[in-house]
């Protein structure tokens, strides 16, 4: 019997990114974001 399998062809990876607040403003501390599929979403 033939076996059929659906495959979207790609995986979406996510990664935590951390930035320093002073690089993007004047505050102290770190900002944590999430990159999904190459796009920072949070």
């Amino acid at each position: 019997d033939a076996e059929f399998r659906h495959d979207s062809g790609y995986e979406v990876h996510h990664q935590k990114l951390v930035f320093f607040a002073e690089d993007v403003g004047s505050n102290k501390g770190a900002i944590i974001g999430l990159m999904v599929g190459g796009v920072v979403i949070a």
């Epitope: 990664q15 935590k16 930035f19 320093f20 607040a21 002073e22 690089d23």
Partner: nanobody, 124 residues
């Protein structure tokens, strides 16, 4: 061109302390975000921690939080990694690295300047 020179590695007993230094030359020190990475044999190079350009903010990997401290001395153009309560699993080659402002601090590809690395061996 910006150059980073690591030093201070060595052999230390578990539970001991070591301070690594990274001297920065050839660039404007205050414009470079600095971080430390490490690479154990057979493993990927991993993020250890970073310090902001002003030195006001630091961020650490969970594995070293509370044990390692990063500081920077603008007068000497040097960044330090103070390592306390060292464990066997801290054995690795340690690299300091520099990145442009505005880039993510915890990923390797943000960093375009690298030191040559200094070996830290923790023995039990």
């Amino acid at each position: 061109a910006v150059q980073l020179v690591d030093s201070g590695g060595g052999l230390v007993q578990a539970g001991g302390s070591l301070r690594l230094s990274c001297a920065v030359s050839g660039g404007t020190f205050s414009s470079i975000g600095m971080g430390w990475f490490r690479q154990a044999p057979g493993k990927e190079r991993e993020f250890v921690g970073a310090i902001s350009r002003s030195g006001d903010s630091t961020y650490y990997a969970d594995s070293v939080k509370g044990r390692f401290t990063i500081s920077r001395d603008g007068a000497k153009n040097t960044v330090y990694l103070q390592m306390n309560s060292l464990k066997d699993e801290d054995t690795a080659v340690y690299y300091c690295a520099g990145r442009p402002a505005g880039t993510a601090i915890n990923i390797r590809r943000s960093y375009n300047y690298w030191g040559q690395g200094t070996q830290v061996t923790v023995s039990s």
